[in-house]
Interface confidence: medium
């Protein structure tokens, strides 16, 4: 199996992780994309994802996670604001392309968040109590993808996953009201 490389980010509590996942523009511009965490001894879990189809430059906020897909540049921008120590871990970007397996984007992100004075901005961030005013998304199904009668998301390669949402629409009343899809199914 190919050893996936990792890119390490060391940030303080309160700062913002700001990463860009590159993808092949022609193949994946409108594909749905997701941000996943890989916890030791567990399956990857999807924390947030773009809409289906993915909209150009349209920010989606899920709790403290903000995704923006820039079709023109072939990159997914991921921000995690107001970082907490417990956010430390291994993350990856994934592109959903049913009925084929999802496509993982390299490199994985090893995030290390430490306690400390966060008044000093991180290497790529103005400090921390930034409040991102992003309107909540109103899509019917967020992470899951097609299947009838329920929507489904397949798992990333070599992980155990697939997911679906209930038949009813997900009503988003605020920016935290978006499901996280654990990608073991």
């Amino acid at each position: 199996a190919t050893k996936l490389t990792e890119e390490k980010y060391e940030l303080k509590e309160g700062q913002t992780l700001d990463v860009k996942c590159d993808y092949t523009l022609e193949k994946f511009a409108s594909s749905q994309k997701a941000w996943q965490i890989i916890r030791d001894g567990e399956m990857p879990k999807t924390l947030a994802c773009t809409e289906r189809p993915s909209k150009n430059s349209h920010p989606v906020q899920v709790g403290r996670i903000i995704l923006e897909d820039y079709h023109d540049h072939g990159l997914l921008r991921v921000r995690m604001v107001n970082l907490q120590v417990e956010d430390s871990g291994l993350y990856q970007c994934v592109i959903y392309q049913p009925p084929k397996e999802p496509h993982m984007l390299f490199d994985r992100i090893r995030l290390v968040v430490t306690k400390g004075f966060s008044g000093t901005p991180g290497s790529n961030e103005n400090s921390t109590q930034n409040v991102y005013k992003i309107p909540p998304t109103t899509t019917k199904a967020l992470c899951p993808l097609y299947t009838s009668p329920r929507t489904v998301t397949q798992a990333p390669p070599k992980s155990t996953a697939d997911v679906s949402t209930p038949d009813s629409e997900i009503n988003l009343t605020n920016v935290t009201d978006i499901i996280r899809v654990p990608v073991f199914n």
Epitope: E42, M43, S148, V152, D162, V163, S164, I179, V181
Partner: antibody
């Protein structure tokens, strides 16, 4: 209609083997992770095992690790649980269940009874 | 493993009255980055398989009557039946799905007084 139907239960002696099946219909079986959950008579629910949508990953409860094997045949829309070295404490109703948008279980079969007794 | 503790073990409530079931997890099932609680509630009637009622601690599964509601966060959760109906007689289980293995509470039997 989304449906899961278990079969293969019965009475078996300790130390013997049994294979349970779960036939899925009404949804794209090959896209879903699947679980086995059991319930001893008069007791609560106990998670047994889970398999990924493509069968590449499997996880087991400590109580069955090394004795039970979960598998699936996506071409037949069927989930299996091979149970070896059965013990009296494995006596239970065995349910297959579909994993949904979280790890919660949104569709359950009716269950099949396994009795391990000499 | 996360231990799920339900209380009470059984509950007798008059028709039309409120029934409240508590569930406590041995560690938080709240995922801070997306603010979701990884807790579900199931109903199991005699001779039937469990049925999903609530997920993400407070989201009702489609088709579940609105007299059922879930609340709580972190480690303490509650399932409330606002006005008990005869068909609600069942055992109710909470389940965490944040950390493997998935674990269930011991169940609460709801009966009519």
């Amino acid at each position: 209609q989304v449906q899961l139907v278990e079969s293969g239960g019965g009475v078996v002696q300790p130390g013997r083997s049994l294979r349970l099946s779960c036939a899925a219909s009404g949804f794209t079986f090959s896209s879903y992770g699947m679980h086995w959950v059991r319930q001893a008579p008069g007791k609560g629910l106990e998670w047994v095992a889970v398999i990924s949508y493509d069968g590449s990953n499997k996880y087991y409860a400590d109580s069955v690790k090394g004795r039970f094997t979960i598998s699936r045949d996506n071409s037949k829309n069927t989930l299996y649980l091979q149970m070896n070295s059965l013990r009296a404490e494995d006596t239970a109703v065995y349910y297959c269940a579909r994993r949904s948008s979280g790890d919660y279980l949104d569709v359950w079969g009716q269950g099949t009874m396994v009795t391990v007794s000499s | 493993d996360i231990v799920m503790t339900q209380s009470p073990d059984s509950l007798a409530v008059s028709l039309g009255e409120r029934a409240t079931i508590n569930c406590k997890s041995s560690q938080s099932v709240l995922y801070s980055s997306n603010n979701k609680n990884y807790l579900a509630w199931y109903q199991q009637k005699p001779g039937q398989p469990p049925k999903l009622l609530i997920y993400w601690a407070s989201t009702r599964e489609s088709g579940v009557p609105d007299r059922f509601s879930g609340s709580g966060s972190g480690t303490d959760f509650t399932l409330t039946i606002s006005s008990l109906q005869a068909e609600d007689v069942a055992v109710y289980y909470c389940q965490q799905y944040d950390v493997d293995p998935l674990t269930f509470g011991g169940g609460t039997k709801v009966e009519i007084k």
